[in-house]
Every structure is written in C-alpha cells, then in structure tokens.
C-alpha cells in the first residue's frame, strides 16, 4: 500500500526583503512524488526552485524537499503543491510569527 507524506512548510530570512520558503515531504511511500512551489496557482519554473533528492528516511519510507526565494509580504500568493499516489494537496507559507506547520494526508 501507500503511505501519504507529512508536509511541512518553513520560512527563513534570505536577503533584505526576501525570504526562503522550504517545503518538506517526509515519511511517504512509494518514492514517486510531485513537490513544487506555485505562485497564484501556477507552478514556478524549474530554474527558480531548488530540489532535494528523494532519499530513504530509514523507516522504509522516503523524504524530499523543495525551496524557493520570494519577496517578503507576498507569502499569501505562494503555496507548496504535493501530489502522491493520486492524492494532491496545497500548503501555505506560515505567517512570520509562526515558523512551521505540517499536515499528514490520508
């Protein structure tokens, strides 16, 4: 069977006026997954995102991540889109005073 991923979005200060947002998917099986950042519902081009390898996490499941840099103040326009085993979900960037959130998808 399949195990849905835990999805966790974090933000960190990059340069003045910019932040780096990172979307991590973990504890999923099988290893095939789509993880991408979207602006206004449209997938960003590949060269504006950085991807981690899909790696085993030691529990028979896998983990990966994707990051991009965005302008501070435009967080609400960006979402992390995840697709795995026919299921999909979107995950917002947390507000500045809350540094992460995560969801497990069934």
């Amino acid at each position: 069977g399949s195990v849905p991923p835990m999805v966790n979005v974090t933000r960190s200060e990059a340069s003045e006026g910019n932040i780096t947002v990172t979307c991590r998917a973990s504890s999923f099986y099988p290893r095939n997954i789509t993880l991408t950042w979207r602006q206004d519902g449209v997938s960003l081009s590949h060269d504006t995102q950085q991807w981690g390898d899909v790696l085993p996490d030691g529990n028979g499941t896998y983990q990966t991540w994707v990051a991009t840099r965005i302008c501070q103040g435009e967080e609400q326009r960006f979402t992390c889109y995840m697709e795995h085993s026919g299921n999909h979900s979107t995950h917002p960037v947390p507000s500045g005073n809350s540094h992460h959130h995560h969801h497990h998808h069934h």
């Epitope: 519902g41 449209v42 997938s43 435009e74 609400q76 889109y81």
Partner: antibody
C-alpha cells in the same frame, strides 16, 4: 479601473511575423501574472501563453511553442506577444488577460485584437 | 495535456428552468485550479466562477459551481434571459492550461 488595450493585429501572410502589444493601466502591473488567450472565428477559447510578474516563469500552449514569445516591460506597463512562422490556423482574436493573484484565473480581459493569416 | 470535455455543447432552456452543465477532465485536477467563464456574442469573456465554487464579483446568486477530481459542474438555479451565453471551464492544474469547448445556453 483596470484597463487592458491590445494592439498590433492585422492581416499577415502565412510564414510572416507580427508583434502584439497590450497596454495595461489601473493596477500595479509588475505584481501580476499576464496571459494571451485567443479565439478563432466562431470557435472556443484557447490559452496561448502565461508570464509571471517577474518574467521567470513562462508557459506556452503546444500549438505555439517555438513560434511565439511572450514578454513584458514592467516599467512601461506593457505585455507583448511576438508571433513568427504564422499559419492560417493562428487566425483569431487575441486577448490580453490579467491573472488573478492567489486564486488564479483570468480576472480581466482586454477587448482583443484580430490577427488574420491569409495570402 | 489535460483535456476538458463540456456537455452538453448546446442547451435550450425556458425562463425559470434549472440549468446544469458539466466539465469533465481527462485526469484528476485540484478544485483550486478550475474556473468558469461567461461569454456573450461580440464581447470578451468574463471570469464567472473561480476555484470551482466561488462566484466572481457581480455574479448573481442563482449561479453555483461544484465538483472535484475529474467532474465539475455549473448550475443556474432559475434561468433568466441575461444568462443566455456560452460558458467555458478552464484548468491550470498543469501546463499547458486548457479550456473546455464550451456550453452554449439559449432561451427556448
């Protein structure tokens, strides 16, 4: 009020080129994604191309990929569509559209400019 | 690419009638990335329903939208003369973005 005004349409010979422009006003142009959508006479809508606010994400319909180029000049509030190797099937009304922030969708449309490809 | 199939292609309705049209996607899409447009002859299209079920500004409450996965619909609860138009669904779940071929609604 948001205004989108297309120009540059007209009669073009097959194999020819044409550059369409869209003058935008009434909103902060450099923060919005933009698109071109076309409609052949008595036919349905066909999306042509998308460009995001920073010009670093661009997508094209398969029917125009390699022949059309979407671009924008943010300081001049203008969107462009460079069309080359034009074919009869490119004959259509070309609409400039503004992409809705957050939710997506073509929230504003111009009145269109007609491109006719014919010998 | 994701193909959107609209049915019926043509609908003739009486005033006051309930009208439903469907949009079927060739593969599953997120309801966040499905929108509807209304177009009247000689005019530019207008965003009518966004993200499957939200009415655009100025759209009468007799319109509604619903759906998920591969099946979406637009419903007019009581047809009025001003609703005669062509309605298109549109997806941006995956590039290339696509439109359905449209449902033309006319007054009987």
């Amino acid at each position: 009020d948001v205004h989108l005004v297309e120009s540059g349409g007209g009669l073009v010979q097959p194999g020819g080129s044409r550059k369409l422009s869209c003058a935008a006003s009434g909103f902060t142009f450099n923060t919005f994604g933009m698109n071109w959508v076309r409609q052949a006479p008595e036919k349905g809508l066909e999306w042509v191309a998308y460009i995001n606010s920073g010009s670093n994400t661009i997508y094209y319909a398969d029917t125009v990929k390699g022949r059309f180029t979407i671009s924008r000049d943010n300081p001049k509030n203008t969107l462009f569509l460079q069309m080359t190797s034009l074919r009869s099937e490119d004959t259509a009304m070309y609409y400039c559209t503004r992409w809705e922030p957050v939710t997506g969708g073509f929230s504003y449309w111009g009145q269109g400019t007609l491109v006719t490809v014919s010998a | 690419q994701i193909v959107l199939t609209q049915s019926p292609a043509f609908k003739s309705s009486s005033l006051g009638e309930r009208v439903t049209m469907t949009c079927t996607a060739s593969s599953s899409i997120s309801s966040s990335y499905l929108h509807w447009y209304q177009q009247k002859p000689g005019s530019s299209p207008k965003l009518w329903i966004y993200t499957t079920s939200n009415l655009a500004s100025g759209v009468p409450a007799r319109f509604s939208g619903s759906g998920s996965g591969t099946s979406y619909s637009l419903t007019i609860s009581t047809m009025e003369a001003e609703d005669a138009a062509t309605y298109y669904c549109h997806q941006h779940h995956r590039s290339p973005f696509t439109f359905g071929s449209g449902t033309k609604v006319e007054i009987k």
